[in-house]
């Protein structure tokens, strides 16, 4: 199980109307450019076999991948939202830096790897899809970690 005290984010992180709105606006703008509506990255398959106490740890992995492999490489797009949302998400990632799991996390890594593989397989359109799901990432992170 995770060291649960470290796998927590204060509710106040998600109670900032301005940055919440900007995150959702960024997701909306990117989703308009997403022509692959059959695939959903953040959905049931991602959380399959993951207990309530492990959800935040899983979402930390998804957040870190999204920042490093999607948002940073695409940082010049979807302005002005991107320049505000990326630092906000990076702060959340930093606050979860001490969130670790005790014992086997293979099932979590397997689920996250499938998401990574899907994004990579789709190429740039996979990255756009990931940005288009930032609203789901935001909400899932909130629901899993507060």
């Amino acid at each position: 199980a995770p060291i649960s005290s470290h796998c927590r984010l204060d509710k106040s992180n998600f109670q900032q109307p301005y940055i919440t709105n900007r995150t959702f606006m960024l997701a909306k703008e990117a989703s308009l450019a997403d022509n692959n509506t059959d695939v959903r990255l953040i959905g049931e398959k991602l959380f399959h076999g993951v207990s309530m106490s492990e959800r935040c740890y899983l979402m930390k992995q998804v957040l870190n991948f999204t920042l490093e492999e999607v948002l940073f490489p695409q940082s010049d797009r979807f302005q002005p939202y991107m320049q505000e949302v990326v630092p906000f998400l990076a702060r959340l990632s930093n606050r979860l830096s001490t969130c670790h799991i005790e014992g086997d996390d293979l099932h979590i890594q397997r689920n996250v790897q499938k998401l990574k593989d899907t994004v990579k397989k789709l190429g740039e359109s996979g990255e756009i899809k990931a940005i288009g799901e930032l609203d789901l990432l935001f909400m899932s992170l909130r629901n899993a970690c507060i």
């Epitope: 998600f14 049931e44 207990s51 309530m52 106490s53 909400m139 899932s140 629901n143 899993a144």
Partner: antibody
């Protein structure tokens, strides 16, 4: 095909106990949490409790102490043990699968089993 | 614990009508809201989650909207099989787990 079938309902006297079963097929209890919900005659839905993938349990505040959820993964069955039953516990009891998609959603549901508490 | 207030509690409508049901939460629940349909003597069936995402197999005449405290379920053109009771349901995280899941009181859609 995913199926949930409740059983064990019936007539019980006030103060009595009853154990309901929810037999599942088409998925594994080691991959999904399961919830119990009840519905009094002509009334709305009321959440009772949940058993997580790791067998942790959480209950509605009113259900704590009298209601216990457990499972037997080898039998693919979830149980609801109800003690010190009262007339107001008369209801149809449903089990449902909890699909977490970033938020908890309950799908599908069993057909329900009727519990009547009366002398 | 969050309280979900549905309105109206019942309504009469005809086949082909546009029907709107509202659900108001006593606190901000973001988009953590689902809608269920229940026919007499049957179990509830998931219609919508994330406030606006249609569940698999649900006809496109059903739609959901809203966030925060005010939510709406709309049936664009009522069909005979849509006469049922509809429930909203919220998930509230971060508080005690004993009040995580809450249902609204229901809205019964009857034939006019």
């Amino acid at each position: 095909e995913v199926q949930l079938v409740e059983s064990g309902g019936g007539l019980v006297q006030p103060g009595g106990s009853l154990r309901l079963s929810c037999a599942v097929s088409g998925f594994s209890l080691s991959s999904y949490a399961m919830i119990w919900v009840r519905q009094a005659p002509g009334k709305g839905l009321e959440w009772i409790g949940i058993i997580d993938i790791d067998a942790s349990t959480y209950y509605a505040s009113w259900a704590k102490g009298r209601f216990t959820i457990s499972r037997d993964s080898s039998k693919n069955t979830v149980y609801l043990q109800m003690n010190s039953l009262r007339a107001e516990d008369t209801a149809v009891y449903y089990c449902a699968r909890d699909r977490f998609v970033g938020v908890d959603i309950f799908d599908p549901w069993g057909q329900g089993t009727l519990v009547t508490v009366s002398s | 614990a969050v309280v979900l207030t549905q309105s109206p509690s019942s309504l009469s409508a005809s086949v082909g009508d546009r029907v709107t049901i509202t659900c108001q939460a006593s606190e901000d629940i973001y988009t953590n809201l689902a809608w269920y349909q229940q026919k007499p003597g049957k179990a509830p069936k998931l219609l919508i989650y994330w406030a606006s995402t249609l569940a698999s197999g649900v006809p496109s005449r059903f739609s959901g909207s809203g966030s925060g405290t005010d939510f709406t379920l709309t049936i664009s053109s009522l069909q005979p099989e849509d006469f049922a009771t509809y429930y909203c349901q919220a998930c509230v995280y971060g508080n005690s787990a004993d009040s995580r899941y809450t249902f609204g009181g229901g809205t019964k859609v009857e034939i006019k």
